[in-house]
């Protein structure tokens, strides 16, 4: 805390200006207003205070905004914002994207802090749901923000926010949460023809249901082994040796390489292997010929 | 994490001249503001010019001698100093504002010693 001391004679502040930066902390404190300070926000980020100076600041402004900043000077907090605690953003009712992302710019290229994450959280509940806008500036900002988010989080993204969603804001997207999205895409995407439709749906098929893949196998999708490798084990493992031959088209010759891992060799396991045969892809592991497979599942469903 | 290493410090004559130099390393993408600050025994650090983007800014007692100067591509601040004067003699530090979190970084200081 800055000791209360009078301001020198002839220094205290008409405007926020670059003069500023040459005072000490208790000048900064003894004089400059706390109104004078909250009328010209907008003129802060533009001068190179430094950080501990930006203390003094953000001390005038809590002084004066007990309850919390309005929005207002938050849109011009810019680098003053790195000061601010989550508890400091609890208080705040950011409603503008334009504040968001002026905010955001400050932290551009480092990872998500706590502040920006109470700030997103602030603003999403905000508005109640996670519109197509702010998805569209959240990921910009943050490519792996929408698999940061859990299940019930992601059930609030309404399918046309589906549109802002890039291939690589879901590479860090576990099962559980594409199992979300996944469903929000089809819907989204639903309008759209064969070739064009699987492009878009591509990256959220770790998503997807058996029927599902079964249909696309129907359509000359060519799947590429790097998607098949992200199903879902339990929606491969129904799928026939023809279904996944059409399903991966000239990319079936991938499946040799990928032999040993999952869900490839979850699937193998469960062909016969006449049908593994016929692929010439030298395939092992599947049922033998003349062996019976009882599917003990269905069985317990009808006992 | 940013260092910094001041060179160029030194004994001058009054009306002499030195150039300040501060290199730096590490994760210098991340720097916004660079700043030159001095201490004269006894006294508090003071700031004496700070460079940000292409702007640049002085202390009055040294506007119009001193000049602050950054090149990107050698990741190096520069000072300046020309017609020295006695009251300039102090340790001369190098300070550079991470962009992305609240904190700073200083150089170990360099001496300079004005003498009449």
């Known amino acids: 805390e800055v000791e209360k001391t009078a301001c020198p004679s002839g220094k205290k502040a008409r405007e926020i200006d670059e003069s500023l930066i040459f005072y000490k902390k208790w000048e900064l404190e003894a004089c400059v207003d706390a109104a004078l300070l909250a009328t010209q926000m907008d003129r802060v980020n533009a001068i190179p205070f430094t950080y501990e100076q930006l203390d003094v600041l953000k001390h005038k402004l809590d002084e004066l905004y007990p309850q919390g900043y309005p929005e207002s000077v938050i849109q011009h907090l810019g680098y003053l914002f790195l000061k601010m605690s989550p508890e400091d953003i609890r208080k705040w009712n950011v409603t503008s994207l334009e504040t968001l992302k002026a905010l955001l710019e400050v932290n551009k290229g480092h990872e998500m802090s706590p502040q920006v994450a109470t700030l997103i959280d602030r603003f999403v509940k905000g508005r109640g749901q996670l519109d197509k806008d702010t998805l569209d500036t959240l990921t910009a900002f943050y490519p792996g923000y929408l698999c940061s988010l859990s299940p019930e989080e992601l059930s609030s993204v309404p399918p046309s926010s589906i549109w802002a969603v890039r291939p690589q804001d879901l590479d860090t997207c576990d099962p559980r949460q594409l199992d979300v999205l996944y469903p929000k895409a089809r819907l989204a995407f639903q309008n759209m023809n064969g070739s064009e439709y699987f492009v878009k749906i591509q990256s959220f098929l770790g998503g997807a249901p058996t029927e599902d893949l079964k249909a696309l196998s129907q359509q000359n999708v060519s799947m590429d082994l790097a998607t098949f490798m992200k199903l879902r084990t339990d929606a491969v493992l129904p799928l026939t040796v023809a279904e996944v031959q059409k399903l991966l088209g000239p990319h079936v010759e991938g499946l040799k390489a990928e032999e040993r891992h999952r869900p490839v060799r979850d699937w193998i396991l469960r062909q016969r292997q006449d049908d593994l045969d016929t692929l010439g892809l030298g395939l092992q592991g599947g049922i033998p010929n003349g062996y019976l497979v009882l599917d003990l599942s269905m069985q317990e469903a009808l006992s | 994490q940013v260092q910094l290493v001041e060179s160029g410090g030194g004994l001058v004559q009054a009306g002499g001249s030195l150039r300040l130099s501060c290199a730096a390393s590490g994760s210098t993408f991340r720097i916004r503001v660079m700043r030159w600050y001095r201490q004269a025994p006894g006294t508090e650090r003071d700031l004496v010019a700070v460079?940000?983007?292409?702007?640049?800014y002085y202390a009055d007692s040294v506007k119009g001698r001193f000049t602050i100067s950054r090149d990107n591509a050698k990741n190096t601040l520069y000072l300046q100093m020309n017609n020295l004067k006695p009251e300039d003699t102090a340790v001369y530090y190098c300070n550079a504002d991470d962009s992305g979190i609240a904190r700073d970084y200083w150089g170990q200081g360099t001496q300079v010693t004005v003498s009449s």
């Open positions: 460079i940000s983007g292409s702007s640049t």
